[in-house]
Protein backbone atom coordinates (compact mmCIF):
# COMPACT_ATOMS: atom_id res chain seq x y z
CA UNK A 1 0.00 0.00 0.00
CA UNK A 2 2.81 2.39 0.95
CA UNK A 3 4.63 1.46 -2.25
CA UNK A 4 1.58 2.27 -4.37
CA UNK A 5 1.16 5.59 -2.55
CA UNK A 6 4.84 6.46 -2.96
CA UNK A 7 4.74 5.57 -6.64
CA UNK A 8 1.50 7.43 -7.25
CA UNK A 9 2.69 10.50 -5.37
CA UNK A 10 5.99 10.40 -7.23
CA UNK A 11 4.12 10.30 -10.51
CA UNK A 12 1.84 13.23 -9.57
CA UNK A 13 4.74 15.34 -8.25
CA UNK A 14 6.74 14.65 -11.43
CA UNK A 15 3.72 15.45 -13.58
CA UNK A 16 3.32 18.84 -11.87
CA UNK A 17 7.07 19.41 -12.16
CA UNK A 18 7.20 18.65 -15.87
CA UNK A 19 4.15 20.84 -16.51
CA UNK A 20 6.06 23.58 -14.68
CA UNK A 21 9.20 23.01 -16.77
CA UNK A 22 7.12 23.30 -19.96
CA UNK A 23 5.44 26.46 -18.63
CA UNK A 24 8.79 28.02 -17.65
CA UNK A 25 10.30 27.21 -21.05
CA UNK A 26 7.40 28.91 -22.83
CA UNK A 27 7.24 31.94 -20.52
CA UNK A 28 8.48 35.35 -21.73
CA UNK A 29 9.57 36.57 -18.31
CA UNK A 30 12.95 34.89 -17.87
CA UNK A 31 14.53 38.27 -17.34
CA UNK A 32 12.68 41.46 -16.50
CA UNK A 33 13.74 45.09 -16.46
CA UNK A 34 15.16 46.05 -13.09
CA UNK A 35 13.05 48.87 -11.68
CA UNK A 36 15.04 49.42 -8.50
CA UNK A 37 17.29 52.50 -8.44
CA UNK A 38 16.51 53.15 -12.11
CA UNK A 39 14.75 56.08 -13.78
CA UNK A 40 11.05 55.28 -13.96
CA UNK A 41 10.45 54.50 -17.61
CA UNK A 42 7.15 54.43 -19.46
CA UNK A 43 8.19 51.11 -20.99
CA UNK A 44 8.86 47.78 -19.34
CA UNK A 45 11.20 45.31 -21.01
CA UNK A 46 11.25 41.58 -20.42
CA UNK A 47 12.80 38.64 -22.22
CA UNK A 48 12.25 34.93 -22.63
CA UNK A 49 14.10 32.08 -24.32
CA UNK A 50 12.24 32.59 -27.58
CA UNK A 51 11.34 36.28 -27.76
CA UNK A 52 11.72 39.66 -26.09
CA UNK A 53 8.82 41.92 -25.18
CA UNK A 54 8.18 45.57 -24.42
CA UNK A 55 5.11 46.65 -22.50
CA UNK A 56 4.31 50.34 -22.80
CA UNK A 57 2.46 52.30 -20.13
CA UNK A 58 -0.25 52.79 -22.75
CA UNK A 59 -0.99 49.11 -22.25
CA UNK A 60 0.36 47.95 -25.59
CA UNK A 61 2.75 45.01 -25.58
CA UNK A 62 5.01 44.21 -28.48
CA UNK A 63 6.93 40.94 -28.64
CA UNK A 64 9.62 40.05 -31.12
CA UNK A 65 10.88 36.53 -31.69
CA UNK A 66 14.56 35.75 -31.98
CA UNK A 67 14.46 34.89 -35.65
CA UNK A 68 18.15 34.10 -35.80
CA UNK A 69 19.79 30.93 -34.59
CA UNK A 70 23.44 31.64 -35.18
CA UNK A 71 23.27 35.20 -33.90
CA UNK A 72 22.10 34.19 -30.42
CA UNK A 73 24.47 33.85 -27.45
CA UNK A 74 25.83 30.33 -26.92
CA UNK A 75 24.60 30.40 -23.32
CA UNK A 76 21.04 31.06 -24.45
CA UNK A 77 21.27 28.17 -26.88
CA UNK A 78 22.60 25.97 -24.07
CA UNK A 79 19.71 26.95 -21.79
CA UNK A 80 17.20 26.21 -24.56
CA UNK A 81 18.83 22.82 -25.11
CA UNK A 82 18.81 21.95 -21.40
CA UNK A 83 15.15 22.88 -21.04
CA UNK A 84 14.12 20.92 -24.14
CA UNK A 85 16.12 17.88 -23.05
CA UNK A 86 14.44 18.18 -19.64
CA UNK A 87 10.98 18.30 -21.23
CA UNK A 88 11.68 15.37 -23.59
CA UNK A 89 13.12 13.17 -20.82
CA UNK A 90 10.29 14.13 -18.52
CA UNK A 91 7.65 13.35 -21.13
CA UNK A 92 9.19 9.93 -21.84
CA UNK A 93 9.47 9.36 -18.10
CA UNK A 94 5.78 10.13 -17.66
CA UNK A 95 4.85 7.75 -20.44
CA UNK A 96 6.95 4.96 -18.94
CA UNK A 97 5.70 5.62 -15.41
CA UNK A 98 2.04 5.39 -16.47
CA UNK A 99 2.61 1.76 -17.48
CA UNK A 100 4.71 1.18 -14.36
CA UNK A 101 1.97 2.28 -11.94
CA UNK A 102 1.01 -0.54 -9.60
CA UNK A 103 -2.63 0.45 -9.73
CA UNK A 104 -2.71 -0.09 -13.50
CA UNK A 105 -2.77 -3.67 -14.78
CA UNK A 106 -1.48 -4.30 -18.28
CA UNK A 107 -1.83 -7.90 -19.34
CA UNK A 108 0.32 -10.22 -17.30
CA UNK A 109 3.12 -7.72 -16.65
CA UNK A 110 5.26 -9.00 -13.83
CA UNK A 111 6.21 -6.91 -10.84
CA UNK A 112 9.85 -7.16 -11.83
CA UNK A 113 9.05 -5.40 -15.13
CA UNK A 114 7.03 -2.76 -13.29
CA UNK A 115 9.91 -2.25 -10.89
CA UNK A 116 12.33 -1.77 -13.75
CA UNK A 117 10.00 0.67 -15.48
CA UNK A 118 9.49 2.58 -12.24
CA UNK A 119 13.26 2.84 -11.79
CA UNK A 120 13.71 3.93 -15.42
CA UNK A 121 11.08 6.64 -15.13
CA UNK A 122 12.50 7.72 -11.79
CA UNK A 123 15.97 8.17 -13.27
CA UNK A 124 14.45 10.05 -16.22
CA UNK A 125 12.63 12.40 -13.85
CA UNK A 126 15.80 13.01 -11.87
CA UNK A 127 17.78 13.84 -15.02
CA UNK A 128 14.87 15.97 -16.32
CA UNK A 129 14.73 17.93 -13.08
CA UNK A 130 18.50 18.40 -13.07
CA UNK A 131 18.39 19.65 -16.68
CA UNK A 132 15.74 22.23 -15.78
CA UNK A 133 17.58 23.36 -12.63
CA UNK A 134 20.85 23.57 -14.57
CA UNK A 135 19.23 25.52 -17.42
CA UNK A 136 17.58 28.03 -15.12
CA UNK A 137 20.76 28.38 -13.06
CA UNK A 138 22.90 29.04 -16.15
CA UNK A 139 20.45 31.76 -17.21
CA UNK A 140 20.42 33.23 -13.71
CA UNK A 141 24.21 33.28 -13.67
CA UNK A 142 24.23 35.14 -17.00
CA UNK A 143 21.78 37.65 -15.57
CA UNK A 144 23.87 38.27 -12.47
CA UNK A 145 27.02 38.74 -14.56
CA UNK A 146 25.32 41.14 -16.96
CA UNK A 147 23.56 42.98 -14.13
CA UNK A 148 26.79 43.93 -12.44
CA UNK A 149 28.42 44.77 -15.74
CA UNK A 150 25.61 47.19 -16.60
CA UNK A 151 25.58 48.58 -13.05
CA UNK A 152 29.26 49.44 -13.39
CA UNK A 153 28.40 51.78 -16.26
CA UNK A 154 24.74 52.48 -15.63
CA UNK A 155 24.97 55.75 -17.48
CA UNK A 156 27.24 56.25 -20.44
CA UNK A 157 27.78 59.38 -22.47
CA UNK A 158 29.99 62.26 -23.52
CA UNK A 159 31.35 63.85 -20.37
CA UNK A 160 28.10 63.19 -18.55
CA UNK A 161 26.30 65.73 -20.71
CA UNK A 162 24.07 63.26 -22.50
CA UNK A 163 22.83 60.36 -20.45
CA UNK A 164 21.79 57.02 -21.84
CA UNK A 165 19.51 54.82 -19.78
CA UNK A 166 21.21 51.46 -19.37
CA UNK A 167 18.49 48.82 -19.10
CA UNK A 168 19.39 46.31 -16.42
CA UNK A 169 17.66 42.97 -16.18
CA UNK A 170 16.86 40.94 -13.11
CA UNK A 171 15.32 37.53 -12.40
CA UNK A 172 11.96 36.99 -14.06
CA UNK A 173 9.08 34.82 -12.85
CA UNK A 174 10.07 32.00 -15.22
CA UNK A 175 13.29 31.41 -13.29
CA UNK A 176 11.43 30.74 -10.06
CA UNK A 177 8.88 28.58 -11.88
CA UNK A 178 11.75 26.65 -13.44
CA UNK A 179 13.61 26.13 -10.17
CA UNK A 180 10.50 24.94 -8.34
CA UNK A 181 9.39 22.75 -11.27
CA UNK A 182 12.85 21.23 -11.61
CA UNK A 183 12.92 20.53 -7.89
CA UNK A 184 9.50 18.88 -7.99
CA UNK A 185 10.50 16.70 -10.95
CA UNK A 186 13.64 15.71 -9.06
CA UNK A 187 11.68 14.85 -5.90
CA UNK A 188 9.16 12.90 -7.97
CA UNK A 189 11.99 10.96 -9.56
CA UNK A 190 13.50 10.08 -6.19
CA UNK A 191 10.08 8.93 -4.98
CA UNK A 192 9.75 6.69 -8.03
CA UNK A 193 13.15 5.17 -7.34
CA UNK A 194 12.17 4.52 -3.70
CA UNK A 195 8.91 2.95 -4.86
CA UNK A 196 10.89 0.72 -7.22
CA UNK A 197 12.60 -0.97 -4.28
CA UNK A 198 9.28 -1.85 -2.74
CA UNK A 199 7.95 -3.15 -6.03
CA UNK A 200 10.84 -5.55 -6.54
CA UNK A 201 9.84 -8.97 -5.12
CA UNK A 202 11.64 -9.83 -1.90
CA UNK A 203 14.68 -12.03 -2.16
CA UNK A 204 15.71 -14.89 0.11
CA UNK A 205 19.03 -14.69 1.85
CA UNK A 206 19.09 -18.27 3.14
CA UNK A 207 21.43 -20.91 1.70
CA UNK A 208 20.26 -23.96 -0.19
CA UNK A 209 19.85 -26.99 2.10
CA UNK A 210 19.53 -30.63 1.05
CA UNK A 211 16.88 -32.66 2.77
CA UNK A 212 17.28 -36.43 2.53
CA UNK A 213 13.96 -38.22 2.71
CA UNK A 214 14.04 -41.90 3.61
CA UNK A 215 13.96 -44.10 0.57
CA UNK A 216 14.39 -41.21 -1.78
CA UNK A 217 17.50 -39.47 -3.00
CA UNK A 218 15.77 -36.25 -3.96
CA UNK A 219 17.33 -32.97 -3.00
CA UNK A 220 14.93 -30.09 -2.42
CA UNK A 221 16.67 -26.86 -3.24
CA UNK A 222 14.81 -23.69 -2.46
CA UNK A 223 15.47 -20.98 -4.99
CA UNK A 224 13.03 -21.53 -7.82
CA UNK A 225 9.79 -20.98 -5.95
CA UNK A 226 8.83 -20.13 -2.44
CA UNK A 227 6.73 -22.69 -0.71
CA UNK A 228 3.32 -21.43 0.12
CA UNK A 229 3.61 -22.70 3.68
CA UNK A 230 7.24 -21.82 4.07
CA UNK A 231 9.32 -18.71 4.31
CA UNK A 232 8.14 -15.17 3.85
CA UNK A 233 4.80 -13.57 4.27
CA UNK A 234 3.68 -14.12 0.71
CA UNK A 235 1.20 -16.89 0.21
CA UNK A 236 1.50 -16.85 -3.56
CA UNK A 237 4.26 -18.59 -5.41
CA UNK A 238 6.54 -15.93 -6.81
CA UNK A 239 9.65 -16.25 -8.84
CA UNK A 240 12.56 -14.92 -6.84
CA UNK A 241 15.95 -13.59 -7.79
CA UNK A 242 19.14 -15.45 -7.03
CA UNK A 243 21.80 -13.68 -5.06
CA UNK A 244 21.57 -11.58 -1.92
CA UNK A 245 19.29 -8.67 -1.23
CA UNK A 246 19.85 -6.09 -3.90
CA UNK A 247 20.18 -2.39 -3.06
CA UNK A 248 19.51 0.41 -5.50
CA UNK A 249 22.02 3.22 -5.09
CA UNK A 250 20.82 6.16 -7.06
CA UNK A 251 23.66 8.08 -8.63
CA UNK A 252 22.75 11.73 -8.35
CA UNK A 253 24.71 14.60 -9.84
CA UNK A 254 24.00 18.02 -8.39
CA UNK A 255 23.45 21.10 -10.46
CA UNK A 256 26.14 23.62 -11.09
CA UNK A 257 24.95 26.97 -10.87
CA UNK A 258 21.89 34.25 -18.10
CA UNK A 259 21.00 38.00 -19.45
CA UNK A 260 21.57 38.30 -23.05
CA UNK A 261 20.90 41.55 -24.79
Amino acid sequence: MAVTACQGLGFVVSLIGIAGIIAATCMDQWSTQDLYNNPVTAVFNYQGLWRSCVRESSGFTECRGYFTLLGLPAMLQAVRALMIVGIVLGAIGLLVSIFALKCIRIGSMEDSAKANMTLTSGIMFIVSGLCAIAGVSVFANMLVTNFWMSTANMYTGMGGMVQTVQTRYTFGAALFVGWVAGGLTLIGGVMMCIACRGLAPEETNYKAVSYHASGHSVAYKPGGFKASTGFGSNTKNKKIYDGGARTEDEVQSYPSKHDYV
Epitope: Q33, P39, T41, A42, V43, E56, S57, S58, G59
Partner: antibody, heavy 117, light 113 residues
Protein backbone atom coordinates in the same frame (compact mmCIF):
# COMPACT_ATOMS: atom_id res chain seq x y z
CA UNK B 1 -16.11 56.89 -33.11
CA UNK B 2 -13.57 57.75 -30.42
CA UNK B 3 -14.44 60.80 -28.37
CA UNK B 4 -13.19 62.40 -25.15
CA UNK B 5 -14.95 65.26 -23.40
CA UNK B 6 -13.73 67.20 -20.39
CA UNK B 7 -16.06 68.97 -18.00
CA UNK B 8 -15.01 71.21 -15.13
CA UNK B 9 -16.08 74.07 -12.89
CA UNK B 10 -14.56 76.82 -15.02
CA UNK B 11 -13.82 79.20 -12.14
CA UNK B 12 -12.25 78.25 -8.81
CA UNK B 13 -11.02 80.40 -5.95
CA UNK B 14 -7.37 80.11 -4.82
CA UNK B 15 -6.61 77.39 -2.22
CA UNK B 16 -9.77 75.55 -3.30
CA UNK B 17 -9.97 72.11 -4.93
CA UNK B 18 -10.72 71.19 -8.48
CA UNK B 19 -12.39 68.20 -10.05
CA UNK B 20 -12.45 67.66 -13.80
CA UNK B 21 -14.22 64.72 -15.44
CA UNK B 22 -13.19 63.18 -18.74
CA UNK B 23 -16.01 61.15 -20.30
CA UNK B 24 -14.94 58.81 -23.08
CA UNK B 25 -16.88 56.98 -25.78
CA UNK B 26 -15.96 54.68 -28.66
CA UNK B 27 -13.50 52.67 -26.56
CA UNK B 28 -13.18 51.09 -23.13
CA UNK B 29 -11.08 52.32 -20.23
CA UNK B 30 -10.14 48.72 -19.56
CA UNK B 31 -8.32 48.67 -22.91
CA UNK B 32 -6.78 52.14 -23.01
CA UNK B 33 -4.91 54.35 -20.58
CA UNK B 34 -5.74 58.03 -20.20
CA UNK B 35 -3.35 60.93 -19.77
CA UNK B 36 -3.94 64.47 -18.53
CA UNK B 37 -2.18 67.51 -20.02
CA UNK B 38 -2.65 71.20 -19.30
CA UNK B 39 -1.78 74.37 -21.22
CA UNK B 40 -1.59 77.78 -19.54
CA UNK B 41 -2.82 80.65 -21.76
CA UNK B 42 -0.29 81.40 -24.51
CA UNK B 43 2.14 78.80 -23.19
CA UNK B 44 3.26 75.25 -23.91
CA UNK B 45 1.97 71.84 -22.88
CA UNK B 46 2.56 70.33 -19.46
CA UNK B 47 2.06 66.63 -18.70
CA UNK B 48 0.14 66.11 -15.44
CA UNK B 49 -0.21 62.36 -15.10
CA UNK B 50 -1.88 59.23 -16.39
CA UNK B 51 -4.05 56.35 -15.31
CA UNK B 52 -3.44 52.90 -16.74
CA UNK B 53 -5.90 50.20 -17.74
CA UNK B 54 -5.50 48.39 -14.42
CA UNK B 55 -6.04 51.58 -12.42
CA UNK B 56 -2.39 52.33 -11.65
CA UNK B 57 -1.29 55.95 -11.87
CA UNK B 58 1.79 58.07 -12.47
CA UNK B 59 2.03 61.78 -11.75
CA UNK B 60 4.20 64.72 -12.61
CA UNK B 61 6.61 64.88 -9.66
CA UNK B 62 6.14 68.66 -9.35
CA UNK B 63 2.38 68.24 -8.78
CA UNK B 64 2.25 64.79 -7.18
CA UNK B 65 1.38 66.03 -3.67
CA UNK B 66 -1.82 67.79 -4.79
CA UNK B 67 -2.88 65.71 -7.75
CA UNK B 68 -5.08 62.63 -7.92
CA UNK B 69 -6.32 60.68 -10.94
CA UNK B 70 -9.01 58.01 -10.70
CA UNK B 71 -11.58 56.40 -12.97
CA UNK B 72 -14.89 54.59 -13.18
CA UNK B 73 -14.70 51.99 -15.94
CA UNK B 74 -18.44 51.26 -15.93
CA UNK B 75 -19.27 54.95 -16.46
CA UNK B 76 -16.35 55.46 -18.88
CA UNK B 77 -15.17 58.38 -16.81
CA UNK B 78 -11.74 59.55 -15.64
CA UNK B 79 -11.39 62.09 -12.85
CA UNK B 80 -8.67 64.64 -12.21
CA UNK B 81 -8.64 66.07 -8.72
CA UNK B 82 -6.31 68.87 -7.70
CA UNK B 83 -6.19 70.72 -4.42
CA UNK B 84 -4.57 73.89 -3.06
CA UNK B 85 -5.08 75.68 -6.37
CA UNK B 86 -3.04 78.76 -7.18
CA UNK B 87 -3.42 81.37 -9.90
CA UNK B 88 -0.70 79.69 -11.97
CA UNK B 89 -2.95 76.62 -12.23
CA UNK B 90 -5.08 78.64 -14.62
CA UNK B 91 -4.94 76.67 -17.86
CA UNK B 92 -6.83 74.63 -20.37
CA UNK B 93 -6.99 71.01 -19.18
CA UNK B 94 -6.98 68.19 -21.71
CA UNK B 95 -7.44 64.44 -21.41
CA UNK B 96 -6.01 62.18 -24.08
CA UNK B 97 -5.99 58.52 -24.96
CA UNK B 98 -2.65 56.74 -24.78
CA UNK B 99 -1.68 54.77 -27.84
CA UNK B 100 1.42 53.24 -29.43
CA UNK B 101 4.68 54.72 -28.24
CA UNK B 102 2.81 56.18 -25.26
CA UNK B 103 1.61 58.91 -27.61
CA UNK B 104 -1.80 60.58 -27.31
CA UNK B 105 -3.76 59.71 -30.42
CA UNK B 106 -7.09 61.26 -29.39
CA UNK B 107 -7.59 64.41 -27.33
CA UNK B 108 -10.61 66.06 -25.80
CA UNK B 109 -11.41 69.68 -26.67
CA UNK B 110 -10.27 70.69 -23.22
CA UNK B 111 -11.87 72.59 -20.38
CA UNK B 112 -10.71 76.01 -19.27
CA UNK B 113 -9.99 76.51 -15.60
CA UNK B 114 -9.52 79.93 -14.13
CA UNK B 115 -8.17 80.26 -10.61
CA UNK B 116 -9.19 83.70 -9.37
CA UNK B 117 -10.65 85.33 -6.32
CA UNK C 1 13.41 65.33 -15.26
CA UNK C 2 14.24 65.13 -18.95
CA UNK C 3 14.59 68.57 -20.50
CA UNK C 4 13.30 68.91 -24.04
CA UNK C 5 14.61 71.78 -26.16
CA UNK C 6 13.20 72.79 -29.53
CA UNK C 7 14.76 75.01 -32.15
CA UNK C 8 14.02 77.35 -33.66
CA UNK C 9 11.28 78.77 -31.47
CA UNK C 10 9.58 80.17 -34.56
CA UNK C 11 9.90 79.74 -38.31
CA UNK C 12 8.62 82.02 -41.04
CA UNK C 13 8.26 80.23 -44.34
CA UNK C 14 6.65 80.47 -47.74
CA UNK C 15 4.20 77.91 -49.08
CA UNK C 16 5.88 74.98 -50.83
CA UNK C 17 9.11 75.44 -48.91
CA UNK C 18 10.86 72.60 -47.10
CA UNK C 19 11.02 73.05 -43.32
CA UNK C 20 13.11 71.31 -40.70
CA UNK C 21 12.71 71.72 -36.95
CA UNK C 22 14.83 70.19 -34.21
CA UNK C 23 14.13 68.61 -30.84
CA UNK C 24 16.81 67.61 -28.36
CA UNK C 25 16.45 65.68 -25.11
CA UNK C 26 18.76 65.73 -22.10
CA UNK C 27 18.69 61.92 -21.96
CA UNK C 28 18.45 59.25 -24.63
CA UNK C 29 14.91 58.27 -25.53
CA UNK C 30 16.06 55.01 -27.14
CA UNK C 31 14.70 51.88 -25.51
CA UNK C 32 17.19 49.03 -25.83
CA UNK C 33 14.42 46.44 -25.52
CA UNK C 34 12.90 47.16 -28.93
CA UNK C 35 15.38 49.69 -30.34
CA UNK C 36 12.66 52.31 -30.59
CA UNK C 37 12.91 55.99 -29.74
CA UNK C 38 10.08 57.14 -27.52
CA UNK C 39 9.62 60.60 -28.98
CA UNK C 40 6.33 61.99 -30.26
CA UNK C 41 5.55 65.02 -32.44
CA UNK C 42 2.27 66.95 -32.12
CA UNK C 43 0.75 69.75 -34.16
CA UNK C 44 -1.45 72.33 -32.44
CA UNK C 45 -3.47 74.87 -34.35
CA UNK C 46 -4.92 77.93 -32.56
CA UNK C 47 -7.97 77.12 -30.43
CA UNK C 48 -7.60 73.36 -31.00
CA UNK C 49 -6.20 70.47 -28.98
CA UNK C 50 -2.86 69.02 -30.13
CA UNK C 51 -2.95 66.47 -32.95
CA UNK C 52 -0.67 63.44 -33.10
CA UNK C 53 1.68 63.46 -36.09
CA UNK C 54 4.58 61.11 -35.40
CA UNK C 55 5.28 58.50 -32.70
CA UNK C 56 8.32 56.29 -32.07
CA UNK C 57 10.29 59.25 -33.56
CA UNK C 58 9.59 58.23 -37.16
CA UNK C 59 6.26 56.38 -37.40
CA UNK C 60 3.58 58.52 -39.04
CA UNK C 61 0.13 58.38 -37.51
CA UNK C 62 -2.57 57.17 -39.88
CA UNK C 63 -4.19 60.03 -41.77
CA UNK C 64 -1.15 62.29 -41.44
CA UNK C 65 0.09 63.56 -44.85
CA UNK C 66 3.36 61.99 -46.01
CA UNK C 67 5.00 65.42 -46.27
CA UNK C 68 5.58 65.08 -42.52
CA UNK C 69 8.65 63.01 -41.71
CA UNK C 70 10.21 62.30 -38.35
CA UNK C 71 13.81 61.20 -37.94
CA UNK C 72 16.62 60.96 -35.41
CA UNK C 73 17.68 58.70 -32.58
CA UNK C 74 18.88 58.88 -29.00
CA UNK C 75 18.81 62.56 -28.09
CA UNK C 76 18.57 64.40 -31.44
CA UNK C 77 15.35 64.41 -33.42
CA UNK C 78 14.02 66.23 -36.45
CA UNK C 79 10.60 66.92 -37.93
CA UNK C 80 10.64 67.73 -41.63
CA UNK C 81 7.77 69.18 -43.65
CA UNK C 82 8.75 68.61 -47.28
CA UNK C 83 6.40 71.17 -48.80
CA UNK C 84 4.66 73.50 -46.38
CA UNK C 85 0.95 74.10 -46.96
CA UNK C 86 -1.17 76.89 -45.50
CA UNK C 87 -2.93 74.39 -43.23
CA UNK C 88 0.43 73.41 -41.68
CA UNK C 89 0.70 76.73 -39.85
CA UNK C 90 0.68 75.74 -36.22
CA UNK C 91 2.87 75.14 -33.17
CA UNK C 92 4.79 71.84 -33.22
CA UNK C 93 5.63 70.12 -29.95
CA UNK C 94 7.90 67.17 -29.29
CA UNK C 95 7.33 64.97 -26.25
CA UNK C 96 9.48 62.55 -24.27
CA UNK C 97 7.45 59.37 -23.93
CA UNK C 98 10.18 57.31 -22.33
CA UNK C 99 11.09 58.55 -18.86
CA UNK C 100 8.65 59.97 -16.34
CA UNK C 101 7.57 62.73 -16.15
CA UNK C 102 6.67 62.72 -19.84
CA UNK C 103 7.89 66.23 -20.64
CA UNK C 104 7.05 68.37 -23.67
CA UNK C 105 9.32 70.69 -25.58
CA UNK C 106 8.52 74.44 -25.61
CA UNK C 107 7.32 74.20 -29.20
CA UNK C 108 8.25 75.57 -32.64
CA UNK C 109 5.82 78.04 -34.19
CA UNK C 110 5.45 77.76 -37.95
CA UNK C 111 4.30 81.01 -39.61
CA UNK C 112 3.70 82.10 -43.19
CA UNK C 113 5.49 85.07 -44.76
Amino acid sequence: QVQLKESGPGLVAPSQSLSITCTVSGFSLTSYAISWVRQPPGKGLEWLGEIWTGGGTNYNSALKSRLSISKDNSKSQVFLKMNSLQTDDTARYYCGRLSYGNSLDYWGQGTTLTVSS
Amino acid sequence: DIVMTQSPSSLTVTAGEKVTMSCKSSQSLLNSGNQKNYLTWYQQKPGQPPKLLIYWASTRESGVPDRFTGSGSGTDFTLTVSSVQAEDLAVYYCQNNFIYPLTFGPGTKLELK
